[in-house]
Interface confidence: medium
Amino acid sequence: MSGLGRSRRGGRSRVDQEERSPQGLWTGVAMRSCPEEQYWDPLLGTCMSCKAICNHQSQRTCATFCRSLNCRKEQGRFYDHLLRDCISCASICGQHPKQCAYFCENKLRSPVNLPPELRRQRSGEVENNSDNSGRYQGSEHRGSEASPALPGLKLSADQLALVYS
């Protein structure tokens, strides 16, 4: 064997560590943890790069990583690992996390480009819940890969501190 397993290290990656179980589920196997952005392929018997299979139809093994990768490719979006969702910065500007700072600050400089609700927000019509550090604290959270909105998803300040710390 050559060229395999050299980068393997202890500790579980944030990327889902999944392996086949006889029941057909993909379950975590701590003893076979792989570096971040890799997964354990039981048939190949080694850690594999998730990037290699993100374009493949069936990437159950790397679903989280691939969603994150695809999300990062889209301007004005970021992947939230706690929510496991692709978040649209446009929907949360004014109460945005640091991941949206570049997008939102550029948008806010040109109010003509803003959607009406954000123009209202900018002129103080909507309560601004961000503190001085710019952390998103308490309004409705919108945006996902499949659709631009996740209506009704409300997060507490504690949850959001977790997400964006």
Epitope: P22, L43, I53, N55
Partner: antibody, heavy 118, light 107 residues
Framework: QVQLVQSGAEVKKPGASVKVSCKAS????????MHWVRQAPGQRLEWMGY????????KYSQKFQGRVTITRDTSASTAYMELSSLRSEDTAVYYC???????????WGQGTTVTVSS | DIQMTQSPSSLSASVGDRVTITCRAS??????LNWYQQKPGKAVKLLMR???RLHSGVPSRFSGSGSGTDFTLTISSLQPEDFATYYC?????????FGGGTKLEIK
């Protein structure tokens, strides 16, 4: 469409080496693992080894360890399997097969017959 | 390594017949069982992955069932082009292993 085209039949003497090629087309070569499988006359299909798509990492069956070398040329979208120290029992049809990431091999080459005879 | 045992090793049937081939794994492999078709001088073809999922372009007369250690491939109505050798393969764990094959011949 996906195609794997292998090199032609070979006749070799015992102790010699053989190198079989597998040219891929119809997909992004570096996105899939390429495996090699052989079938001796009257025998079952036998897995030999594979090469990873994004680096030159390889893994071989214990049975062939030390005698088999799988390589690739990304620019030519071609994988190679070299088997050394040939013996008569290596007479077989050698196949390259693309791994579909789900535990199966979704496309195969047409096979290359290697005959080892003195 | 997981051992795969196919039966029967050969089978004679006629066009229009319903045919069943079985494959047994030496240990539980869930549903990670694939079937292939091989004709002389032709490339091996994937028929079915994950026990019962037809590969693209495979006719619906082919079906698969089973789980754990016992699996079957069924051809509901044999066509002339179905006379070939069929292999099962476990995709559950390294290294991949194949059954001994079932040769389907014209009666």
């Amino acid at each position: 469409q996906v195609q794997l085209v292998q090199s032609g039949a070979e006749v070799k003497k015992p102790g010699a080496s053989v190198k079989v090629s597998c040219k891929a087309s119809g997909y992004t070569f570096t996105n899939y693992v390429m495996h090699w499988v052989r079938q001796a006359p009257g025998q079952r299909l036998e897995w030999m080894g594979y090469i990873l798509p994004y680096n030159d990492g390889t893994k071989y069956s214990q049975k062939f360890q030390g005698r088999v070398t799988i390589t690739r040329d990304t620019s030519a979208s071609t994988a190679y399997m070299e088997l050394s120290s040939l013996r008569s029992e290596d007479t077989a049809v050698y196949y390259c097969a693309r791994y579909d990431w789900e535990g199966s091999f979704d496309y195969w080459g047409q096979g290359t017959t290697v005959t080892v005879s003195s | 390594d997981i051992q795969m045992t196919q039966s029967p090793s050969s089978l004679s049937a006629s066009v229009g017949d319903r045919v069943t081939i079985t494959c047994r794994a030496s240990q539980d492999i869930g549903n990670y069982l694939n079937w292939y078709q091989q004709k002389p001088g032709k490339a091996v073809k994937l028929l079915m992955r994950y026990t019962s999922r037809l590969h693209s372009g495979v006719p619906s007369r082919f079906s698969g069932s089973g789980s754990g250690t016992d699996f079957t491939l069924t051809i509901s109505s044999l066509q002339p082009e179905d006379f070939a050798t069929y292999y099962c393969q476990q995709g559950f764990t390294f290294p991949p292993t194949f059954g001994g094959g079932t040769k389907l011949e014209i009666k």
